[in-house]
Structure formats: structure tokens, C-alpha cells
């Protein structure tokens, strides 16, 4: 009997409001045994995969996707999905990334009080 897969969670470090040119890391979490984490844009056809999975806790695994230099094109909704054989999970809730222009005051990142500490990962070929 196939197990019911919990929905993944998604968060962003240092937050969801990022100054233009700064970095952001998306953190996807799921159960132990996830083989592939996928970070999706609004359209499911635009995504980034990783199998570089590590322990978030004794019962959770996580993957991180980093954008080094955020542009306006990176703004928008993101969500996670994962593959744990033999099936894919449901998608996480959407997380909206907002990009602040250089003329605007930097955000106080009020969205990020629950974000875990960064390990400095970097997403490749991300959008």
C-alpha cells in the first residue's frame, strides 16, 4: 500500500521581499526519503530540480535553491513539489517573491521571522 505523502513546505531566506541584485534562497521541505525536490514557477513548465537533499530534522529532509542576484524577472509565485518513489507529492502553497527596486527603501523583511538559518545554497540555471 502506497503511503500518503505530506505536502511540502516552502520558505525563503532572508525573506520574501528582496532588493534588486541581492540573493534569495528558497527552502523546500518534505519527509525523509525524498529523491528529488522541484522548485516551480507559476507555470509548471518552468522548474529547477535538485537531488542534493539533507536532513532538516530526524523526520524531515530539505533542499535549497539559491538565486545569487535577483532581478525583476525573478518576482512572482514559487512552489515546491517532490518525488518520493513511486510518486510525486502535491504542490506546496505558493510563496510570492517581491523584488524591491534600487530607489525604494529596503524592506524590513517582515515576512521572514520564521525562516531557518541559511546554509548558502545556490540554484543553477534558475529562470
Amino acid at each position: 500500500q502506497e503511503e500518503d505523502l505530506p505536502r511540502p513546505s516552502i520558505s525563503a531566506e532572508p525573506g520574501t521581499v528582496i532588493p534588486l541584485g541581492s540573493h534569495v534562497t528558497f527552502v523546500c521541505r518534505g519527509p525523509v526519503g525524498v529523491q528529488t525536490f522541484r522548485l516551480e514557477r507559476e507555470s509548471r513548465s518552468t522548474y529547477n530540480d535538485t537531488e542534493d537533499v539533507s536532513q532538516a530534522s530526524p523526520s524531515e529532509s530539505e533542499a535549497r535553491f539559491r538565486i545569487d542576484s535577483v532581478s525583476e524577472g525573478n518576482a512572482g509565485p514559487y512552489r515546491c513539489i517532490y518525488y518520493k518513489p513511486p510518486k510525486w507529492s502535491e504542490q506546496s502553497d505558493y510563496l510570492e517573491l517581491l523584488v524591491k527596486g534600487p530607489t525604494q527603501r529596503p524592506s524590513d523583511n517582515s515576512h521572514n521571522e520564521h525562516a531557518p538559518a541559511s546554509q548558502g545554497l545556490k540554484a543553477e540555471h534558475l529562470y
Partner: antibody
Framework: EVQLVETGGGLVQPKGSLKLSCAAS????????MNWVRQAPGKGLEWVAR??????????FYADSVKDRFTISRDDSQSMLYLQMNNLKTDDTAMYYC??????????WGQGTPVTVSA | DIQMTQSPASQSASLGESVTITCLAS??????LGWYRQKPGKSPQLLIY???SLADGVPSRFSGSGSGTKFSFKISSLQAEDFVIYYC?????????FGSGTKLEIK
């Protein structure tokens, strides 16, 4: 088909150096963490080193027994994994395996390359 | 460091029998545990990951159970090729430590 082919092993004197290489094919190398594991003759398995992906700033981790002597590195453009071994000791004599991570577990192993440290 | 205590060190059994190997972690590792087998002169092969999940292509006579600190690995209906060495490994924290191995011998 996933393939991991280790090369570079051989006979080296104590305090000498050796560089092991692992050529990877059959999978998307740059999305996987990679490891080196060794096995001394007639003994059990010992994890040696781990390197994560560009997503993780290529973070590296080492067993205490090799820290400050061994360096793990990777070249994603060539799908290559390396282990630079300096100041070798007789205790480093072992078969060295290149191992691909999947789901955080050691899913695929190379055939190994033997390293003998002896005067 | 997390120590992995694997037992027994060796076990004799007959074809068609079942055997169970246990692994105890010195601290909780959730289900961050793998089981491997190694045939003579060959590389290790992943059999079970995440304590209970069967790796690709592994026969269903192999199974794993447990979480936290106590784990079991069972082979039901032993076949000739099963009489080799088995290792557990924790992947919860570095250094990633292996058990000392269990040699399965034919009775």
C-alpha cells in the same frame, strides 16, 4: 546507466600525495552531492568526505581521520569528482569508492580504486 | 559522533530461512538509515533507504523497519547470493557512520 569510474590509485610512500579521480556519467552530475568512502583490506566501510552542489556553495565535510590532509572537489562541467590526498599514512591503505548521493543516501557506487601506502 | 552498533557480527542460516539484523544508533536519527550489502570483491549496494524504503531493483524479500535509535533489517526466504556482508549506515549527521557489518554464512 549510471557509471562512476575511479582512477588514480596506486602505491605511494608515507607522507606522499595522491589524487583520485571519478568520472561520472548517466545522470545529471551537478544536482547531486558526492562522496568518497573507503574500505581497508578485510575491514568495514568508512565514510571519508562529502561535497554538496553549487546550490550549497560546494560545502565540504570530512571524517576526522582525514581532515586537513584530504581535499574533496568537483568539476561539474566535466562531471568529475576528485580527492586530493596529502601526508598519507599507512592507515590510509584502502579501496576508495566514489559514491553518488540520492535522497541523502549512498545510491550508486563506483568499482573502487586501490591505494596502498607503504615504505 | 553517532555510533552505529550492528549485531550480530556473523550469523549462520539455511537456504529458505529468514534472518534479522539489528542496528542501534547512539542518538536519535529518525529514519535517516540505510542498509547495504557487499558481495566479495564488489562494491556495496544500497538495499534500503530511509529505514524502510526499498531501493530500485531490490527484491521484496528484503525489508527494513524502525526509527529513532533502533532499526531492523530482514531477509525472508534466503537465497544463495544472500550469504554476504551487510552494513547499516546513519546519514543524519556528519561524520556519516557505518555499522561494523554482519557476515551471513550458509549453515
Amino acid at each position: 546507466e549510471v557509471q562512476l569510474v575511479e582512477t588514480g590509485g596506486g602505491l605511494v610512500q608515507p607522507k606522499g600525495s595522491l589524487k583520485l579521480s571519478c568520472a561520472a556519467s548517466g545522470f545529471t552530475f551537478n544536482i547531486n552531492a558526492m562522496n568518497w568512502v573507503r574500505q581497508a583490506p578485510g575491514k568495514g566501510l568508512e565514510w571519508v568526505a562529502r561535497i554538496r552542489t553549487k546550490n550549497n556553495n560546494y560545502a565540504t565535510f570530512y571524517a576526522d581521520s582525514v581532515k586537513d590532509r584530504f581535499t574533496i572537489s568537483r568539476d561539474d562541467s566535466q562531471s568529475m569528482l576528485y580527492l586530493q590526498m596529502n601526508n598519507l599514512k599507512t592507515d590510509d591503505t584502502a579501496m576508495y569508492y566514489c559514491v553518488r548521493d540520492r535522497a541523502g543516501f549512498f545510491a550508486y557506487w563506483g568499482q573502487g580504486t586501490p591505494v596502498t601506502v607503504s615504505a | 559522533d553517532i555510533q552505529m552498533t550492528q549485531s550480530p557480527a556473523s550469523q549462520s542460516a539455511s537456504l529458505g530461512e529468514s534472518v534479522t539484523i539489528t542496528c542501534l544508533a547512539s542518538q536519535t536519527i529518525g529514519t535517516w538509515l540505510g542498509w547495504y550489502r557487499q558481495k566479495p570483491g564488489k562494491s556495496p549496494q544500497l538495499l534500503i533507504y530511509a529505514a524502510t524504503s526499498l531501493a530500485d531493483g531490490v527484491p521484496s524479500r528484503f525489508s527494513g523497519s524502525g526509527s529513532g535509535t533502533k532499526f531492523s533489517f530482514k531477509i525472508s526466504s534466503l537465497q544463495a547470493e544472500d550469504f554476504v556482508i551487510y552494513y547499516c549506515q546513519q546519514l543524519y549527521s556528519t561524520p556519516l557512520t557505518f555499522g561494523s557489518g554482519t557476515k551471513l554464512e550458509i549453515k
